[in-house]
């Protein structure tokens, strides 16, 4: 029979014959021959291969370096890489999460629109009229100004985006 020029899925062409690829979690040791199938071997501890392959070496699992603020989110297997995330209060600097930075705090006059996660930074928004934030925080939203009216008080000092209103007693009517 004519030697093949193309092979089926999960096969590769070598020496004019189609050999089976190694399954995820295994590496290639020896190509198939006329008499035997492809020889594959499981990846070692702390190694992985995540596709059908003909790799002769497995990849090393990612190391989540605590010195860079990283910790293991999901332990790697022979078929998957380790997934790193950042310690509490920190987030990844990239999609690959190779290092971490401290979550940004929202300055006075700004509130937290979205709290940071292990992979995304804090999103701040300016406090609109009627709201304020007087602290630098990675968690605090803009707070509404105090409603003096509901307390039977009057505004003595107008609020800003950084300060609350100051309420005071109503002026007594003279007799």
């Amino acid at each position: 029979p004519e030697p093949p020029t193309a092979c089926r899925e999960k096969q590769y062409l070598i020496n004019s014959q189609c050999c089976s690829l190694c399954q995820p979690g295994q590496k290639l040791v020896s190509d198939c021959t006329e008499f035997t199938e492809t020889e594959c071997l499981p990846c070692g501890e702390s190694e992985f291969l995540d596709t059908w392959n003909r790799e002769t070496h497995c990849h090393q699992h990612k190391y989540c370096d605590p010195n860079l603020g990283l910790r293991v989110q999901q332990k790697g297997t022979s078929e998957t890489d380790t997934i790193c995330t950042c310690e509490e209060g920190w987030h990844c600097t990239s999609e690959a999460c190779e290092s971490c930075v401290l979550h940004r705090s929202c300055s006075p006059g700004f509130g937290v629109k979205q709290i940071a996660t292990g992979v995304s930074d804090t999103i701040c928004e300016p406090c609109p009229v009627g709201f304020f934030s007087n602290v630098s925080s990675a968690f605090e939203k803009c707070h509404p100004w105090t409603s003096c009216e509901t307390k039977d008080l009057v505004v003595q000092q107008a609020g800003t985006n950084k300060t609350d209103v100051v309420c005071g007693p109503q002026d007594r009517l003279r007799a």
């Epitope: 040791v29 008499f35 020889e39």
Partner: antibody, heavy 112, light 112 residues
Amino acid sequence: EVQLVESGGGLVKPGGSLRLSCAASGFTFSSYAMSWVRQAPGKGLEWVSEISGGGSYTYYPDTVTGRFTISRDNAKNSLYLQMNSLRAEDTAVYYCASRAYWGQGTLVTVSS
Amino acid sequence: DIVMTQTPLSLPVTPGEPASISCRSSQSIVHSQGNTYFEWYLQKPGQSPQLLIYKVSNRFSGVPDRFSGSGSGTDFTLKISRVEAEDVGVYYCFQGSHVPYTFGGGTKVEIK
């Protein structure tokens, strides 16, 4: 030219041990699974063991499992068969084979 | 274990005439990956076995085209289109798909 040369055969008492060797040349030894096949006097062929090209996997029939161990040294282009607890019924010519090519065989005689 | 049954046991042949040997396996010898590791070997008098056919129907290099193999599943055939005097010897079928690998009992081909 492909060559497979066996050595190590001889006369051994029942219960004894013997180590066969096979020196290979003329082909990419590490690419091929290698086997030992035996032939008792006046009888047919019997497969005894196989080892994969990289040496990761070994296979045996029940008749020799636990007594025989196949191994290889790809750096030396050599195949081995360690035979322990030998029995009279292990008497045979032992061939080293890559399936495509066979050695000339070495005679193992187990007798008291 | 897979039993390989060859017929006939003995085959007297006339040079120039065709000859056919049958081999039947006790179960399918298709490997899990889809290949059928079935081979035919010839052992000429006083010599080591030599490969004739691999994977059912592929002639090994240097094997004359008068030899052909066919079959599938459990039934396999070796045909010699025109027997020559040098073809005498014992023919063995072999399955290398499932451990333990097994040989047929052999068919002795001799000139009438």
